[in-house]
Interface confidence: medium
Amino acid sequence: EMKKRVEDLHVGATVAPSSRRDFTFDLYRALASAAPSQSIFFSPVSISMSLAMLSLGAGSSTKMQILEGLGLNLQKSSEKELHRGFQQLLQELNQPRDGFQLSLGNALFTDLVVDLQDTFVSAMKTLYLADTFPTNFRDSAGAMKQINDYVAKQTKGKIVDLLKNLDSNAVVIMVNYIFFKAKWETSFNHKGTQEQDFYVTSETVVRVPMMSREDQYHYLLDRNLSCRVVGVPYQGNATALFILPSEGKMQQVENGLSEKTLRKWLKMFKKRQLELYLPKFSIEGSYQLEKVLPSLGISNVFTSHADLSGISNHSNIQVSEMVHKAVVEVDESGTRAAAATGTIFTFRSARLNSQRLVFNRPFLMFIVDNNILFLGKVNRP
Protein backbone atom coordinates (compact mmCIF):
# COMPACT_ATOMS: atom_id res chain seq x y z
CA GLU A 1 0.00 0.00 0.00
CA MET A 2 2.90 2.35 0.77
CA LYS A 3 4.62 1.28 -2.45
CA LYS A 4 1.50 2.24 -4.39
CA ARG A 5 1.64 5.63 -2.73
CA VAL A 6 5.21 6.12 -3.96
CA GLU A 7 4.33 5.27 -7.53
CA ASP A 8 1.39 7.68 -7.45
CA LEU A 9 3.20 10.50 -5.69
CA HIS A 10 3.21 13.82 -7.51
CA VAL A 11 5.41 16.23 -5.65
CA GLY A 12 3.96 19.71 -5.70
CA ALA A 13 2.12 19.49 -8.98
CA THR A 14 0.35 16.99 -11.13
CA VAL A 15 2.91 17.23 -13.90
CA ALA A 16 6.34 15.65 -13.67
CA PRO A 17 8.70 18.33 -12.37
CA SER A 18 11.78 19.07 -14.39
CA SER A 19 15.10 18.72 -12.64
CA ARG A 20 15.63 22.46 -12.59
CA ARG A 21 13.40 23.14 -9.62
CA ASP A 22 12.11 21.22 -6.66
CA PHE A 23 9.34 23.77 -5.99
CA THR A 24 7.96 22.26 -2.79
CA PHE A 25 11.28 22.00 -1.04
CA ASP A 26 12.79 25.19 -2.41
CA LEU A 27 9.74 27.00 -1.06
CA TYR A 28 10.18 25.25 2.29
CA ARG A 29 13.83 26.34 2.46
CA ALA A 30 12.91 29.90 1.50
CA LEU A 31 10.36 30.02 4.33
CA ALA A 32 12.79 28.39 6.76
CA SER A 33 15.61 30.80 6.04
CA ALA A 34 13.25 33.77 6.39
CA ALA A 35 12.33 32.69 9.93
CA PRO A 36 14.79 30.06 11.19
CA SER A 37 13.35 29.56 14.66
CA GLN A 38 9.70 29.64 13.65
CA SER A 39 7.36 26.77 12.93
CA ILE A 40 6.54 26.43 9.25
CA PHE A 41 3.39 25.05 7.73
CA PHE A 42 2.08 25.26 4.19
CA SER A 43 0.37 23.27 1.48
CA PRO A 44 2.53 22.73 -1.60
CA VAL A 45 -0.32 21.29 -3.62
CA SER A 46 -2.58 24.18 -2.74
CA ILE A 47 0.01 26.85 -3.59
CA SER A 48 0.94 25.08 -6.82
CA MET A 49 -2.71 25.05 -7.70
CA SER A 50 -3.21 28.76 -7.14
CA LEU A 51 -0.09 29.60 -9.14
CA ALA A 52 -1.24 27.37 -11.98
CA MET A 53 -4.60 29.11 -11.85
CA LEU A 54 -2.88 32.47 -12.03
CA SER A 55 -0.93 31.30 -15.06
CA LEU A 56 -4.28 30.95 -16.88
CA GLY A 57 -4.40 34.72 -17.11
CA ALA A 58 -0.69 35.41 -17.47
CA GLY A 59 1.13 36.02 -20.70
CA SER A 60 4.68 35.85 -22.08
CA SER A 61 7.49 35.91 -19.50
CA THR A 62 5.09 36.18 -16.54
CA LYS A 63 3.51 32.86 -17.45
CA MET A 64 6.89 31.30 -18.16
CA GLN A 65 8.22 32.40 -14.76
CA ILE A 66 5.24 30.85 -12.98
CA LEU A 67 5.46 27.52 -14.78
CA GLU A 68 9.25 27.31 -14.54
CA GLY A 69 9.10 28.33 -10.89
CA LEU A 70 6.74 25.43 -10.29
CA GLY A 71 9.33 23.18 -11.89
CA LEU A 72 6.99 22.22 -14.71
CA ASN A 73 8.41 21.14 -17.98
CA LEU A 74 5.67 21.79 -20.46
CA GLN A 75 7.39 19.97 -23.26
CA LYS A 76 6.40 16.89 -21.34
CA SER A 77 2.74 17.86 -21.08
CA SER A 78 0.61 20.60 -22.46
CA GLU A 79 -0.78 23.44 -20.41
CA LYS A 80 -4.24 22.07 -21.00
CA GLU A 81 -3.22 18.81 -19.31
CA LEU A 82 -1.73 20.72 -16.42
CA HIS A 83 -5.00 22.53 -15.71
CA ARG A 84 -7.05 19.40 -16.28
CA GLY A 85 -4.82 17.58 -13.84
CA PHE A 86 -5.47 20.19 -11.16
CA GLN A 87 -9.19 20.14 -11.92
CA GLN A 88 -9.27 16.39 -11.34
CA LEU A 89 -7.20 16.72 -8.20
CA LEU A 90 -9.51 19.37 -6.77
CA GLN A 91 -12.52 17.19 -7.42
CA GLU A 92 -10.83 14.27 -5.64
CA LEU A 93 -9.75 16.38 -2.68
CA ASN A 94 -13.12 18.05 -2.24
CA GLN A 95 -15.04 14.80 -2.29
CA PRO A 96 -16.76 14.25 1.07
CA ARG A 97 -15.18 11.34 2.92
CA ASP A 98 -15.86 9.75 6.28
CA GLY A 99 -13.71 11.12 9.08
CA PHE A 100 -11.92 13.43 6.68
CA GLN A 101 -12.42 17.22 6.59
CA LEU A 102 -10.64 19.09 3.85
CA SER A 103 -11.50 22.60 2.75
CA LEU A 104 -9.30 23.87 -0.04
CA GLY A 105 -10.00 26.86 -2.20
CA ASN A 106 -8.82 29.85 -4.14
CA ALA A 107 -10.44 33.23 -4.61
CA LEU A 108 -9.55 36.42 -6.38
CA PHE A 109 -10.57 39.74 -4.87
CA THR A 110 -10.21 42.54 -7.43
CA ASP A 111 -10.63 46.26 -7.20
CA LEU A 112 -13.95 47.66 -8.44
CA VAL A 113 -12.23 49.36 -11.36
CA VAL A 114 -10.82 46.08 -12.70
CA ASP A 115 -12.86 44.43 -15.46
CA LEU A 116 -12.12 40.72 -15.53
CA GLN A 117 -11.98 38.80 -18.80
CA ASP A 118 -14.96 36.46 -19.06
CA THR A 119 -12.80 33.62 -20.40
CA PHE A 120 -10.51 33.85 -17.37
CA VAL A 121 -13.39 33.95 -14.90
CA SER A 122 -15.08 30.93 -16.45
CA ALA A 123 -11.81 28.95 -16.70
CA MET A 124 -11.11 29.75 -13.03
CA LYS A 125 -14.57 28.55 -12.03
CA THR A 126 -14.56 25.43 -14.18
CA LEU A 127 -11.01 24.25 -13.61
CA TYR A 128 -10.22 25.57 -10.14
CA LEU A 129 -13.69 26.03 -8.60
CA ALA A 130 -12.46 29.51 -7.73
CA ASP A 131 -14.57 32.55 -6.99
CA THR A 132 -13.93 36.16 -7.95
CA PHE A 133 -15.21 39.11 -5.97
CA PRO A 134 -15.27 42.81 -6.77
CA THR A 135 -13.87 44.59 -3.72
CA ASN A 136 -13.63 48.18 -2.62
CA PHE A 137 -10.03 48.32 -1.43
CA ARG A 138 -10.34 52.04 -0.60
CA ASP A 139 -12.37 50.87 2.39
CA SER A 140 -9.59 48.65 3.66
CA ALA A 141 -11.42 47.62 6.85
CA GLY A 142 -14.49 46.61 4.87
CA ALA A 143 -12.40 44.79 2.26
CA MET A 144 -10.51 42.91 4.93
CA LYS A 145 -13.78 41.88 6.61
CA GLN A 146 -15.16 40.71 3.24
CA ILE A 147 -12.09 38.50 2.60
CA ASN A 148 -11.86 37.11 6.13
CA ASP A 149 -15.58 36.39 6.34
CA TYR A 150 -15.47 34.57 3.01
CA VAL A 151 -12.63 32.28 4.11
CA ALA A 152 -14.18 31.68 7.54
CA LYS A 153 -17.43 30.66 5.86
CA GLN A 154 -15.69 28.37 3.37
CA THR A 155 -13.75 26.61 6.14
CA LYS A 156 -16.71 26.45 8.55
CA GLY A 157 -14.97 28.78 10.95
CA LYS A 158 -11.70 26.87 11.03
CA ILE A 159 -9.67 29.61 9.35
CA VAL A 160 -10.44 33.05 10.68
CA ASP A 161 -8.48 36.30 10.37
CA LEU A 162 -6.71 35.29 7.19
CA LEU A 163 -5.68 38.92 6.71
CA LYS A 164 -4.41 40.98 9.61
CA ASN A 165 -4.04 44.19 7.62
CA LEU A 166 -4.61 45.40 4.09
CA ASP A 167 -3.04 47.95 1.79
CA SER A 168 -5.69 50.32 0.44
CA ASN A 169 -3.70 50.56 -2.81
CA ALA A 170 -4.33 46.89 -3.51
CA VAL A 171 -5.71 46.00 -6.93
CA VAL A 172 -5.74 42.20 -6.93
CA ILE A 173 -5.55 40.01 -3.85
CA MET A 174 -5.30 36.32 -4.35
CA VAL A 175 -6.38 34.13 -1.48
CA ASN A 176 -5.52 30.47 -1.07
CA TYR A 177 -6.63 28.47 1.96
CA ILE A 178 -6.62 24.86 3.10
CA PHE A 179 -7.86 23.25 6.30
CA PHE A 180 -7.40 19.57 7.10
CA LYS A 181 -8.63 17.40 9.92
CA ALA A 182 -8.85 13.65 9.56
CA LYS A 183 -9.15 10.63 11.76
CA TRP A 184 -6.20 8.33 12.21
CA GLU A 185 -6.73 4.81 10.96
CA THR A 186 -6.20 3.71 14.56
CA SER A 187 -6.82 6.18 17.34
CA PHE A 188 -4.41 7.10 20.08
CA ASN A 189 -5.81 6.22 23.49
CA HIS A 190 -6.95 9.38 25.31
CA LYS A 191 -5.85 7.82 28.60
CA GLY A 192 -2.35 7.60 27.22
CA THR A 193 -2.09 11.35 26.61
CA GLN A 194 0.02 12.94 29.34
CA GLU A 195 1.84 16.21 29.84
CA GLN A 196 5.51 15.81 28.91
CA ASP A 197 8.53 18.01 28.27
CA PHE A 198 9.18 19.25 24.75
CA TYR A 199 12.65 20.65 24.16
CA VAL A 200 12.25 23.67 21.88
CA THR A 201 15.98 24.18 22.42
CA SER A 202 18.25 22.66 25.04
CA GLU A 203 17.47 25.72 27.22
CA THR A 204 13.77 26.14 26.41
CA VAL A 205 11.45 23.41 27.64
CA VAL A 206 7.66 23.55 27.34
CA ARG A 207 5.02 21.14 28.60
CA VAL A 208 2.86 19.56 25.90
CA PRO A 209 0.08 16.97 25.87
CA MET A 210 1.93 13.93 24.49
CA MET A 211 -0.18 11.24 22.83
CA SER A 212 1.14 7.69 22.84
CA ARG A 213 0.39 4.45 21.10
CA GLU A 214 2.22 1.17 20.66
CA ASP A 215 1.56 -0.32 17.26
CA GLN A 216 3.10 -1.41 13.98
CA TYR A 217 4.12 1.66 12.01
CA HIS A 218 5.99 2.30 8.81
CA TYR A 219 9.41 3.31 10.08
CA LEU A 220 12.91 3.98 8.93
CA LEU A 221 16.18 5.30 10.21
CA ASP A 222 17.87 7.54 7.63
CA ARG A 223 21.51 7.54 8.64
CA ASN A 224 22.54 9.80 5.76
CA LEU A 225 20.30 12.62 6.90
CA SER A 226 20.42 11.69 10.61
CA CYS A 227 16.73 11.34 11.24
CA ARG A 228 14.02 8.84 12.01
CA VAL A 229 10.82 8.79 9.96
CA VAL A 230 7.49 7.27 10.93
CA GLY A 231 4.34 7.01 8.83
CA VAL A 232 0.97 7.21 10.57
CA PRO A 233 -1.96 6.47 8.26
CA TYR A 234 -5.17 8.44 8.24
CA GLN A 235 -8.46 6.86 7.31
CA GLY A 236 -8.65 6.84 3.53
CA ASN A 237 -5.61 7.56 1.46
CA ALA A 238 -3.60 10.11 3.40
CA THR A 239 -0.59 9.41 5.58
CA ALA A 240 1.21 11.69 7.99
CA LEU A 241 4.99 11.38 7.97
CA PHE A 242 6.73 12.62 11.09
CA ILE A 243 10.47 13.19 10.80
CA LEU A 244 12.58 13.39 13.96
CA PRO A 245 16.07 14.73 13.29
CA SER A 246 18.83 13.69 15.66
CA GLU A 247 19.77 16.42 18.12
CA GLY A 248 21.37 19.34 16.33
CA LYS A 249 20.64 17.87 12.89
CA MET A 250 17.49 19.77 11.91
CA GLN A 251 19.31 21.91 9.36
CA GLN A 252 21.02 18.90 7.83
CA VAL A 253 17.62 17.27 7.34
CA GLU A 254 16.07 20.47 5.96
CA ASN A 255 18.89 20.82 3.46
CA GLY A 256 18.40 17.23 2.37
CA LEU A 257 14.67 17.53 1.72
CA SER A 258 13.83 16.78 -1.89
CA GLU A 259 11.40 14.86 -4.00
CA LYS A 260 14.02 12.13 -4.23
CA THR A 261 14.37 11.95 -0.45
CA LEU A 262 10.62 11.68 0.05
CA ARG A 263 10.32 8.96 -2.58
CA LYS A 264 13.20 7.11 -0.94
CA TRP A 265 11.52 7.28 2.47
CA LEU A 266 8.21 6.03 1.15
CA LYS A 267 9.96 3.20 -0.68
CA MET A 268 12.24 2.19 2.19
CA PHE A 269 9.63 2.10 4.94
CA LYS A 270 9.51 -1.11 6.95
CA LYS A 271 6.72 -2.14 9.32
CA ARG A 272 8.01 -1.87 12.87
CA GLN A 273 6.62 -2.23 16.36
CA LEU A 274 7.04 1.20 17.95
CA GLU A 275 6.04 3.00 21.10
CA LEU A 276 5.20 6.30 19.43
CA TYR A 277 4.94 9.49 21.47
CA LEU A 278 3.59 12.43 19.49
CA PRO A 279 2.48 15.86 20.71
CA LYS A 280 -1.17 16.73 20.31
CA PHE A 281 -1.14 20.00 18.42
CA SER A 282 -2.76 22.32 15.95
CA ILE A 283 -0.47 24.01 13.48
CA GLU A 284 -1.08 26.78 11.05
CA GLY A 285 0.98 28.77 8.63
CA SER A 286 0.05 32.07 7.06
CA TYR A 287 2.22 33.53 4.33
CA GLN A 288 2.40 36.55 2.09
CA LEU A 289 3.68 34.64 -0.91
CA GLU A 290 4.50 37.77 -2.88
CA LYS A 291 7.39 38.22 -0.43
CA VAL A 292 8.71 34.66 -0.79
CA LEU A 293 8.08 33.53 -4.37
CA PRO A 294 10.49 36.02 -6.00
CA SER A 295 13.38 34.05 -4.48
CA LEU A 296 12.08 31.06 -6.45
CA GLY A 297 12.09 33.03 -9.68
CA ILE A 298 8.40 34.00 -9.63
CA SER A 299 8.55 37.78 -9.42
CA ASN A 300 7.04 39.48 -12.48
CA VAL A 301 3.48 38.80 -11.47
CA PHE A 302 3.91 40.94 -8.33
CA THR A 303 5.54 43.90 -10.08
CA SER A 304 4.69 46.50 -12.69
CA HIS A 305 6.29 44.11 -15.23
CA ALA A 306 3.38 41.71 -14.81
CA ASP A 307 1.62 40.58 -17.95
CA LEU A 308 -1.84 39.60 -16.73
CA SER A 309 -3.61 40.52 -19.93
CA GLY A 310 -5.57 37.28 -19.76
CA ILE A 311 -7.14 38.41 -16.50
CA SER A 312 -8.02 41.98 -17.40
CA ASN A 313 -7.58 44.54 -20.16
CA HIS A 314 -6.18 46.90 -17.56
CA SER A 315 -2.64 47.59 -18.68
CA ASN A 316 -1.02 48.05 -15.27
CA ILE A 317 -2.61 45.24 -13.30
CA GLN A 318 -0.42 43.20 -10.95
CA VAL A 319 -1.04 40.89 -7.98
CA SER A 320 -0.72 43.04 -4.88
CA GLU A 321 -0.85 40.22 -2.37
CA MET A 322 -0.97 36.47 -2.55
CA VAL A 323 -2.04 35.09 0.79
CA HIS A 324 -1.82 31.42 1.74
CA LYS A 325 -3.04 29.92 4.98
CA ALA A 326 -2.88 26.26 5.97
CA VAL A 327 -4.27 24.74 9.17
CA VAL A 328 -4.09 21.19 10.50
CA GLU A 329 -5.20 19.71 13.80
CA VAL A 330 -3.52 16.63 15.24
CA ASP A 331 -5.29 14.80 18.05
CA GLU A 332 -6.08 11.29 19.23
CA SER A 333 -9.22 10.59 17.20
CA GLY A 334 -9.21 7.55 15.02
CA THR A 335 -11.69 5.54 13.06
CA ARG A 336 -10.73 2.43 14.94
CA ALA A 337 -10.17 2.18 18.65
CA ALA A 338 -6.58 1.54 19.63
CA ALA A 339 -5.95 -1.82 21.16
CA ALA A 340 -4.48 -0.23 24.28
CA THR A 341 -6.13 -0.52 27.68
CA GLY A 342 -5.73 1.85 30.62
CA THR A 343 -2.20 0.56 31.13
CA ILE A 344 -0.16 2.40 28.60
CA PHE A 345 3.06 0.43 28.23
CA THR A 346 4.38 -2.64 29.93
CA PHE A 347 7.91 -3.98 29.61
CA ARG A 348 8.28 -7.46 28.27
CA SER A 349 11.36 -9.58 27.73
CA ALA A 350 14.25 -7.61 26.26
CA ARG A 351 13.94 -8.61 22.63
CA LEU A 352 10.19 -8.13 22.35
CA ASN A 353 10.51 -4.57 23.56
CA SER A 354 9.41 -2.23 20.82
CA GLN A 355 11.50 0.82 20.08
CA ARG A 356 10.45 4.10 21.69
CA LEU A 357 10.18 7.04 19.36
CA VAL A 358 9.54 10.27 21.24
CA PHE A 359 8.83 13.47 19.33
CA ASN A 360 9.96 15.72 22.17
CA ARG A 361 12.07 18.14 20.13
CA PRO A 362 11.46 20.06 16.89
CA PHE A 363 10.36 17.80 14.06
CA LEU A 364 9.12 17.91 10.49
CA MET A 365 5.85 16.62 9.17
CA PHE A 366 4.38 15.83 5.78
CA ILE A 367 0.82 14.88 4.98
CA VAL A 368 0.75 13.00 1.70
CA ASP A 369 -1.83 11.22 -0.35
CA ASN A 370 -0.87 11.17 -4.00
CA ASN A 371 0.46 14.67 -3.51
CA ILE A 372 2.14 16.56 -0.72
CA LEU A 373 -0.90 18.09 0.93
CA PHE A 374 1.17 19.70 3.68
CA LEU A 375 4.76 20.20 4.71
CA GLY A 376 5.80 21.75 7.97
CA LYS A 377 8.19 22.10 10.83
CA VAL A 378 6.89 21.97 14.39
CA ASN A 379 9.28 24.00 16.52
CA ARG A 380 6.92 24.52 19.41
CA PRO A 381 3.65 22.53 19.47
Partner: antibody, heavy 119, light 111 residues
Amino acid sequence: QVQLQQSGAELVKPGASVKMSCKAFGYTFTTYPIEWMKQNHGKSLEWIGKFHPDNDDTNYNEKFKGKAKLTVEKSSSTVYLELSRLTSDDSAVYYCARGHDYDYGMDYWGQGTSVTVSS
Amino acid sequence: DIVLTQSPASLAVSLGQRATISCKASQSVDYDGDSYLNWYQQKPGQPPKLLIYGASNLESGTPARFSGSGSGTDFTLDIHPVEEEDAATYYCQQSNEDPPTFGGGTKLEIT
Protein backbone atom coordinates in the same frame (compact mmCIF):
# COMPACT_ATOMS: atom_id res chain seq x y z
CA GLN B 1 9.61 -21.20 16.83
CA VAL B 2 11.84 -19.13 14.54
CA GLN B 3 14.05 -21.27 12.34
CA LEU B 4 16.17 -20.79 9.22
CA GLN B 5 16.81 -23.95 7.26
CA GLN B 6 19.67 -23.94 4.74
CA SER B 7 20.29 -26.30 1.83
CA GLY B 8 22.97 -29.01 1.98
CA ALA B 9 26.71 -28.94 1.29
CA GLU B 10 27.93 -28.33 -2.26
CA LEU B 11 31.02 -29.54 -4.11
CA VAL B 12 31.50 -27.53 -7.29
CA LYS B 13 34.09 -27.03 -10.00
CA PRO B 14 36.01 -23.76 -10.50
CA GLY B 15 34.23 -21.38 -12.89
CA ALA B 16 30.82 -22.88 -12.14
CA SER B 17 27.96 -21.32 -10.15
CA VAL B 18 26.14 -22.49 -7.06
CA LYS B 19 22.73 -21.54 -5.67
CA MET B 20 21.90 -22.22 -2.05
CA SER B 21 18.65 -21.62 -0.20
CA CYS B 22 17.50 -20.37 3.17
CA LYS B 23 13.92 -21.14 4.17
CA ALA B 24 12.29 -19.22 7.03
CA PHE B 25 9.82 -20.69 9.52
CA GLY B 26 8.00 -19.44 12.59
CA TYR B 27 7.60 -15.71 11.92
CA THR B 28 6.16 -13.25 9.38
CA PHE B 29 8.67 -13.55 6.58
CA THR B 30 8.21 -10.02 5.23
CA THR B 31 8.94 -8.30 8.53
CA TYR B 32 12.68 -8.97 8.78
CA PRO B 33 15.60 -8.87 6.35
CA ILE B 34 17.60 -12.00 5.60
CA GLU B 35 21.35 -11.41 5.73
CA TRP B 36 24.13 -13.62 4.36
CA MET B 37 27.62 -14.17 5.78
CA LYS B 38 30.71 -16.01 4.59
CA GLN B 39 33.05 -17.77 7.00
CA ASN B 40 36.31 -19.23 5.79
CA HIS B 41 37.45 -22.28 7.72
CA GLY B 42 38.38 -21.20 11.25
CA LYS B 43 38.28 -17.52 10.30
CA SER B 44 36.07 -14.54 11.02
CA LEU B 45 32.83 -13.65 9.26
CA GLU B 46 32.21 -11.40 6.28
CA TRP B 47 28.85 -9.86 5.45
CA ILE B 48 27.79 -10.54 1.85
CA GLY B 49 24.49 -8.69 1.68
CA LYS B 50 20.88 -8.63 2.73
CA PHE B 51 17.46 -8.99 1.19
CA HIS B 52 14.36 -7.36 2.66
CA PRO B 53 11.24 -9.26 1.59
CA ASP B 54 9.03 -6.35 2.72
CA ASN B 55 9.98 -4.19 -0.26
CA ASP B 56 12.36 -6.41 -2.26
CA ASP B 57 15.28 -4.23 -1.26
CA THR B 58 18.72 -5.74 -1.79
CA ASN B 59 21.99 -4.44 -0.34
CA TYR B 60 25.38 -5.90 -1.20
CA ASN B 61 28.81 -5.54 0.27
CA GLU B 62 30.85 -3.81 -2.45
CA LYS B 63 33.33 -6.70 -2.22
CA PHE B 64 30.69 -9.24 -3.29
CA LYS B 65 29.03 -7.27 -6.08
CA GLY B 66 29.19 -9.32 -9.26
CA LYS B 67 29.94 -12.44 -7.24
CA ALA B 68 26.75 -12.83 -5.20
CA LYS B 69 23.10 -12.50 -6.20
CA LEU B 70 20.16 -12.62 -3.80
CA THR B 71 16.68 -13.63 -4.92
CA VAL B 72 13.45 -14.56 -3.17
CA GLU B 73 10.51 -16.89 -3.49
CA LYS B 74 7.93 -15.34 -1.19
CA SER B 75 5.40 -18.14 -1.54
CA SER B 76 7.80 -20.51 0.21
CA SER B 77 9.49 -17.87 2.46
CA THR B 78 12.82 -18.70 0.87
CA VAL B 79 15.79 -16.50 0.02
CA TYR B 80 18.47 -17.74 -2.37
CA LEU B 81 22.14 -16.87 -2.61
CA GLU B 82 23.79 -17.55 -5.95
CA LEU B 83 27.57 -17.36 -6.29
CA SER B 84 29.04 -17.22 -9.77
CA ARG B 85 32.48 -17.75 -11.38
CA LEU B 86 33.64 -19.79 -8.41
CA THR B 87 37.29 -20.03 -7.39
CA SER B 88 38.97 -21.77 -4.47
CA ASP B 89 38.65 -18.46 -2.52
CA ASP B 90 34.92 -19.05 -2.46
CA SER B 91 35.28 -22.30 -0.50
CA ALA B 92 33.67 -21.49 2.85
CA VAL B 93 30.61 -21.96 5.02
CA TYR B 94 27.78 -19.58 4.08
CA TYR B 95 25.25 -18.60 6.71
CA CYS B 96 21.91 -16.89 6.36
CA ALA B 97 20.54 -15.03 9.37
CA ARG B 98 17.54 -12.94 10.26
CA GLY B 99 18.38 -9.27 10.66
CA HIS B 100 17.08 -7.64 13.80
CA ASP B 101 14.31 -5.07 13.68
CA TYR B 102 16.43 -2.03 14.42
CA ASP B 103 19.78 -2.94 12.89
CA TYR B 104 20.93 -4.66 16.06
CA GLY B 105 22.73 -7.60 14.56
CA MET B 106 21.27 -10.95 13.54
CA ASP B 107 19.17 -12.84 16.02
CA TYR B 108 18.54 -16.20 14.32
CA TRP B 109 20.99 -18.10 12.11
CA GLY B 110 20.73 -20.98 9.69
CA GLN B 111 22.97 -24.01 10.23
CA GLY B 112 25.22 -23.00 7.33
CA THR B 113 25.90 -24.37 3.86
CA SER B 114 29.42 -25.63 3.18
CA VAL B 115 30.70 -24.89 -0.33
CA THR B 116 33.87 -26.57 -1.59
CA VAL B 117 35.32 -25.44 -4.91
CA SER B 118 37.63 -28.06 -6.33
CA SER B 119 38.44 -29.57 -9.71
CA ASP C 1 34.52 0.00 5.99
CA ILE C 2 34.65 0.08 9.78
CA VAL C 3 37.43 -2.16 11.11
CA LEU C 4 36.86 -3.94 14.43
CA THR C 5 39.94 -5.09 16.31
CA GLN C 6 39.43 -7.66 19.05
CA SER C 7 41.89 -8.43 21.79
CA PRO C 8 43.20 -10.75 22.96
CA ALA C 9 43.08 -13.23 20.06
CA SER C 10 42.86 -16.06 22.60
CA LEU C 11 42.28 -16.22 26.29
CA ALA C 12 42.51 -18.94 28.96
CA VAL C 13 40.46 -18.39 32.12
CA SER C 14 39.90 -20.59 35.14
CA LEU C 15 36.43 -21.81 35.94
CA GLY C 16 34.55 -19.23 38.04
CA GLN C 17 36.91 -16.39 37.14
CA ARG C 18 36.26 -13.32 34.94
CA ALA C 19 36.90 -13.20 31.19
CA THR C 20 37.19 -9.77 29.54
CA ILE C 21 37.26 -9.29 25.79
CA SER C 22 37.85 -5.92 24.14
CA CYS C 23 36.63 -4.65 20.76
CA LYS C 24 37.90 -1.38 19.24
CA ALA C 25 36.29 0.23 16.20
CA SER C 26 38.17 2.32 13.63
CA GLN C 27 35.38 4.93 13.94
CA SER C 28 32.37 5.49 16.15
CA VAL C 29 29.53 2.99 15.83
CA ASP C 30 27.12 5.21 17.76
CA TYR C 31 24.06 6.78 16.24
CA ASP C 32 21.82 9.21 18.07
CA GLY C 33 22.83 7.93 21.50
CA ASP C 34 22.64 4.23 20.63
CA SER C 35 25.64 1.96 20.07
CA TYR C 36 25.26 -0.45 17.16
CA LEU C 37 27.70 -3.03 18.48
CA ASN C 38 26.74 -6.67 18.99
CA TRP C 39 28.47 -9.73 20.45
CA TYR C 40 28.19 -13.34 19.22
CA GLN C 41 29.33 -16.68 20.57
CA GLN C 42 30.31 -19.47 18.16
CA LYS C 43 31.09 -23.04 19.06
CA PRO C 44 32.81 -25.45 16.61
CA GLY C 45 30.47 -26.75 13.90
CA GLN C 46 27.69 -24.36 14.91
CA PRO C 47 26.48 -20.99 13.61
CA PRO C 48 27.17 -17.86 15.68
CA LYS C 49 24.63 -17.04 18.38
CA LEU C 50 23.66 -13.48 19.30
CA LEU C 51 24.48 -12.77 22.96
CA ILE C 52 24.34 -8.99 23.32
CA TYR C 53 22.96 -6.30 21.03
CA GLY C 54 23.25 -2.54 21.21
CA ALA C 55 26.47 -2.83 23.26
CA SER C 56 24.78 -3.79 26.52
CA ASN C 57 21.36 -5.42 25.95
CA LEU C 58 21.17 -9.12 26.73
CA GLU C 59 19.48 -11.13 24.00
CA SER C 60 16.71 -13.23 25.50
CA GLY C 61 18.20 -16.55 26.59
CA THR C 62 21.64 -15.06 27.31
CA PRO C 63 22.69 -15.87 30.90
CA ALA C 64 23.11 -12.89 33.25
CA ARG C 65 26.82 -13.69 33.73
CA PHE C 66 27.38 -12.07 30.32
CA SER C 67 27.52 -8.28 30.21
CA GLY C 68 28.50 -5.72 27.62
CA SER C 69 29.60 -2.12 27.98
CA GLY C 70 31.12 0.74 26.06
CA SER C 71 30.20 3.37 23.50
CA GLY C 72 31.70 5.15 20.51
CA THR C 73 34.78 3.11 19.57
CA ASP C 74 35.61 1.09 22.71
CA PHE C 75 33.57 -1.89 23.84
CA THR C 76 33.97 -4.75 26.30
CA LEU C 77 32.37 -8.15 26.79
CA ASP C 78 32.59 -9.53 30.34
CA ILE C 79 31.81 -13.07 31.45
CA HIS C 80 31.72 -13.67 35.19
CA PRO C 81 31.78 -16.24 36.61
CA VAL C 82 33.01 -18.23 33.62
CA GLU C 83 31.46 -21.66 33.16
CA GLU C 84 32.60 -24.73 31.24
CA GLU C 85 30.02 -24.20 28.48
CA ASP C 86 31.39 -20.70 27.72
CA ALA C 87 34.37 -22.18 25.86
CA ALA C 88 33.88 -20.76 22.35
CA THR C 89 35.01 -18.05 19.96
CA TYR C 90 33.48 -14.62 20.56
CA TYR C 91 32.95 -12.03 17.81
CA CYS C 92 31.97 -8.40 17.99
CA GLN C 93 30.05 -6.92 15.06
CA GLN C 94 29.01 -3.37 14.15
CA SER C 95 25.71 -2.62 12.44
CA ASN C 96 25.95 1.15 12.35
CA GLU C 97 27.22 1.38 8.81
CA ASP C 98 27.04 -0.76 5.69
CA PRO C 99 28.70 -3.08 5.24
CA PRO C 100 28.31 -4.58 8.71
CA THR C 101 31.69 -5.86 9.83
CA PHE C 102 32.94 -8.42 12.36
CA GLY C 103 35.96 -8.47 14.63
CA GLY C 104 38.60 -11.16 14.12
CA GLY C 105 37.33 -13.20 17.08
CA THR C 106 38.61 -14.14 20.52
CA LYS C 107 38.93 -17.81 21.43
CA LEU C 108 38.07 -18.47 25.07
CA GLU C 109 39.47 -21.57 26.73
CA ILE C 110 38.39 -22.66 30.19
CA THR C 111 41.10 -24.08 32.44
